[in-house]
């Protein structure tokens, strides 16, 4: 028996369902009574789901997994993982045994989009050219860790005096806070871009500082 999985990682958004595809080629006359199917975590061999003795043995992994029972006899051994969590990320091995056996691993990459950044300024009044100001760009509930870029109004990257911190919450999602310290010119626009490297999703925020009231 030869087991086939997708070579590319499966990307799944947090709280959505994901399908880890796995297939094998049944011989003529194959019956489910002959099938021994195991899904397990590659790195620990922890059992996730199994099908033996002609029966779906069910989920051994937080009761969020399911097979496609009607498709098994055709060689579809794919696994459905419901309500994906950050902690589900990793490699899953599909092991099929009939007369002989084979296995293959598929990677699950979990992702969550970052929120539109909010911008704050300190100090936020009585600003004069030459003042040192701190601009904070905050974006929330994303995964995996973000890449943060700052630019001025002309699109020139600002790399000095930038401090970025990323903190995971209890669900494993990251809140990003990036701080830019800059000396004010006569006026100027400062943009922050928060990029999710897996989703290739960019979230933009900007603040324009003039002699007049601030605009965000």
């Amino acid at each position: 028996v030869e087991v086939q999985v997708s070579e590319d990682p499966v990307v799944a958004l947090v709280d959505t369902d994901a399908t880890l595809r796995c297939s094998f080629s049944p011989e003529p006359g194959f019956s489910l009574a002959q099938l021994n199917l195991i899904w397990q975590l590659t790195d620990t061999k922890q059992l996730v789901h199994s099908f033996t003795e002609g029966r779906d043995q069910g989920s051994a992994y937080s009761n969020r997994t399911a097979l496609f029972p009607d498709l098994l006899v055709q060689g579809n051994a794919s696994l459905r993982l419901q309500r994906v969590r950050v902690t589900d990320e990793g490699s899953y091995t599909c092991f099929v045994s009939i007369q002989d056996f084979d296995s293959a691993a598929v990677s699950l990459q979990v992702a969550a989009p970052y929120s539109k950044p909010s911008m704050t300024l300190e100090p936020n009044k009585d600003l004069r050219p030459g003042n040192m100001v701190t601009i904070t760009c905050s974006s929330y509930q994303g995964y995996p860790e973000a890449e943060v870029f700052w630019k001025d109004g002309q699109g020139v990257p600002l790399t000095g005096n930038v401090t970025t911190s990323q903190m995971a919450n209890e669900r494993g999602l990251f809140d990003v806070h990036s701080v830019l310290r800059v000396v004010l010119g006569a006026n100027g626009t400062y943009s922050c871009l928060v990029r999710n490297p897996v989703l290739q999703q960019d979230a933009h925020g900007s603040v324009t500082i003039t002699g007049q009231p601030l605009t965000f």
């Epitope: 021994n36 397990q40 620990t44 061999k45 059992l47 003795e53 043995q57 092991f95 007369q99 296995s103």
Partner: antibody
Framework: EVQLLESGGGLVQPGGSLRLSCAAS????????MSWVRQAPGKGLEWVSG????????YYADSVKGRFTISRDNSKNTLYLQMNSLRAEDTAVYYC???????????WGQGTTVTVSS | QSVLTQPPSASGTPGQRVTISCSGS????????VNWYQQLPGTAPKLLIS??QRPSGVPDRFSGSKSGTSASLAITGLQSEDEADYYC???????????FGGGTKLTVL
């Protein structure tokens, strides 16, 4: 040729320590889980410990938990078993074995003898 | 007390067929590969059969089968050099441990 070669066995007093090594050759060591299995004189085979290919996951038999530590150095193609607080009942031939993706210990070393006695 | 149960001994005459049984549970043999090892006196164990698959170099006189939570090893055309200890083994995903049978000493009469 696929080969596993154990070393480090010997005579040690109860409460003492010993470190076993298993040198692997002829295959991509870093791609395989590995195990230690022992056999007391005149007795059957007893699994001792296992470790994942990267070393991130380790498992132990209840009889050695907290006393033995399995580790590996993939750059040196070597598996280790650090044995502390040794007891007379740890006296055995210790084998290292390759543990493949199909849950088969398919290649075994020739074994190294550990004797715990005062 | 071993997790997998094997008869302690078996015997046969040259040319005969002998079988050795191994009984386990759903968390080991029931869904995991069952392996059979031959250990000749004074040597390391050697893989003989996995489920019903023979590694290259193992004579086709040796065969394995598995049904439910039990497995068996059959040896046909018994030869004097088959006299050895035979062990079944499987990964147990409830115990997170390899489990072995107590071993069966095969005597060729």
């Amino acid at each position: 040729e696929v080969q596993l070669l154990e070393s480090g066995g010997g005579l040690v007093q109860p409460g003492g320590s010993l470190r076993l090594s298993c040198a692997a050759s002829g295959f991509t060591f870093s791609s395989y889980w590995m195990s230690w299995v022992r056999q007391a004189p005149g007795k059957g085979l007893e699994w001792v410990s296992g470790i994942s290919s990267s070393g991130s996951a380790t498992y132990y038999a209840d009889s050695v938990k907290g006393r033995f530590t399995i580790s590996r150095d993939n750059s040196k193609n070597t598996l280790y078993l650090q044995m502390n607080s040794l007891r007379a009942e740890d006296t055995a031939v210790y084998y290292c074995a390759r543990w493949n993706d199909y849950d088969i210990m398919d290649v075994w070393g020739q074994g190294t003898t550990v004797t715990v006695s005062s | 007390q071993s997790v997998l149960t094997q008869p302690p001994s078996a015997s046969g005459t040259p040319g005969q067929r002998v079988t050795i049984s191994c009984s386990g549970s759903s968390s080991n043999i029931g869904r995991r590969t069952v392996n059979w090892y031959q250990q000749l006196p004074g040597t390391a164990p050697k893989l003989l059969i996995s489920n019903s698959q023979r590694p290259s170099g193992v004579p086709d006189r040796f065969s394995g089968s598995k049904s439910g939570t039990s497995a068996s090893l059959a040896i046909t055309g018994l030869q004097s050099e088959d006299e050895a200890d035979y062990y079944c083994a499987s990964w147990d995903d409830s115990l997170n441990a390899w489990v072995f049978g107590g071993g069966t000493k095969l005597t060729v009469l």
